[in-house]
């Protein structure tokens, strides 16, 4: 079998949902010593970066300015050390937003409910679209999809305090081209009287994986790596 290097990690810096005409930044984290990184888009080569010096950095950033529907889709990356290529990274879906119109999000029976109540979100957009998406702030990877001509329902079932938080919806023109976001709707779920005060609201931190953790190798790291390699050889 043909030898390959471990697959790199691909991430979107800040978010995978990029407003049209804004810049997307994708990070490809491979390994120290990689002389070339390639970004692939829908299976075709999109961009190349050669880090300098290659032994001092474990990944690169690919910048995609002027985001539009032609650049929205599935991205992956690979890297090369010497003549040896890595496996392909997982696929990353890059979405362009702020296309066309703005939907309206509402919630029934209302934004303030008691734990155990059934809640349904409604997303409405009058321009032609059939797919709607509901996202909770701080959980942008957990996208709920629903279908309808001008309106879609998102039944939540009996809610708990874990459902608390801000929600937005989008109309989708295809999997990678979304409308402007709706205005947020904040769902407040009160629990049993004794533990209402204890139930924390859901954090609205940005998604932890939407950051680029590229590092430059210091002399100390290099010495430790060399020492570790020598120790491994001695143990053998």
């Amino acid at each position: 079998p043909k030898q390959t290097l471990p697959k790199p990690i691909i991430r979107a810096e800040s978010t995978y949902m990029v407003p049209k005409e804004k810049q997307a930044t994708l990070c490809c984290q491979g390994s120290y010593g990689a002389v070339e990184y390639q970004l692939h888009f829908e299976g075709s080569l999109f961009a190349v970066e050669r880090p300098k010096p290659p032994e001092r950095i474990n990944g690169v950033k690919f910048h995609i300015p002027d985001m539009n529907s032609r650049k929205a889709g599935r991205y992956s990356c690979i890297y090369r050390v010497g003549e040896l290529w890595s496996e392909r990274s997982d696929l990353l879906d890059l979405v362009v937003t702020e296309m066309y119109d703005t939907p309206t999000l509402s919630v029934h029976p209302g934004p303030e409910v008691t734990s155990g109540e059934k809640v349904t979100f409604y997303c409405r957009l009058d321009t032609a679209t059939s797919m709607f998406l509901l996202l909770k702030e701080g959980r942008s990877r957990d996208v709920q999809r629903s279908y309808g001509k001008v309106q879609a329902e998102f039944p939540m079932g009996p809610v708990t305090t874990a459902h608390r938080g801000s929600y937005r919806c989008f109309g989708s023109y295809n999997n990678y081209a979304w409308s402007f976001p709706s205005e947020p709707v904040k769902l407040l779920v009160t629990g049993d009287i004794e533990n209402t005060s204890l139930a924390p609201t859901d954090p609205t931190f940005p998604d932890s994986w939407d950051t680029c953790l590229l590092t430059r190798e210091t002399g100390l790291q290099k010495d430790l790596a060399l020492w570790d390699h020598t120790a491994q050889n001695l143990l053998r």
Partner: nanobody, 126 residues
Framework: EVQLVESGGGEVQPGGSLRLSCAAS????????MGWFRQAPGKEREFVAA???????YYAESVKGRFTISRDNAKNTVYLQMSSLRAEDTAVYYC????????????????????WGQGTLVTVKP
């Protein structure tokens, strides 16, 4: 707004050479990544060569060793030196730019480019 104007096209015999130029207007040239694409009659536009802000280059396999891309930031111009030309190099050659860009990315996919020239025709025939 960036405007790109290609020149240097013409008719040449197989084995001959040509140098294409692409003059860019605007102050953003130094922060632009540049590329050359070509389109032969009845075919799709294809990547030829590209250059990053800091002069890193990348070539299509079909032109590697024969074509050289370079840039002169003082003149806001990118060049494509073509040698050992073949009949299959006959096409309209387009200059393109990615503006703005950061880092040292070299762009290969046509979708990456947001500014395009009108093209210059290169014909290779005996």
């Amino acid at each position: 707004e960036v405007q790109l104007v290609e020149s240097g096209g013409g008719e040449v015999q197989p084995g001959g050479s040509l140098r294409l130029s692409c003059a860019a207007s605007g102050r953003t040239f130094a922060s632009a990544a540049m590329g050359w694409f070509r389109q032969a009659p009845g075919k799709e536009r294809e990547f030829v060569a590209a250059i990053s802000r800091s002069d890193d280059t990348y070539y299509a396999e079909s032109v590697k060793g024969r074509f050289t891309i370079s840039r002169d930031n003082a003149k806001n111009t990118v060049y494509l030196q073509m040698s050992s030309l073949r009949a299959e190099d006959t096409a309209v050659y387009y200059c393109a730019a990615v503006v703005p860009t950061y880092g040292n990315n070299i762009y290969v996919h046509s979708a990456a480019y947001n500014y395009w020239g009108q093209g210059t025709l290169v014909t290779v025939k005996p």
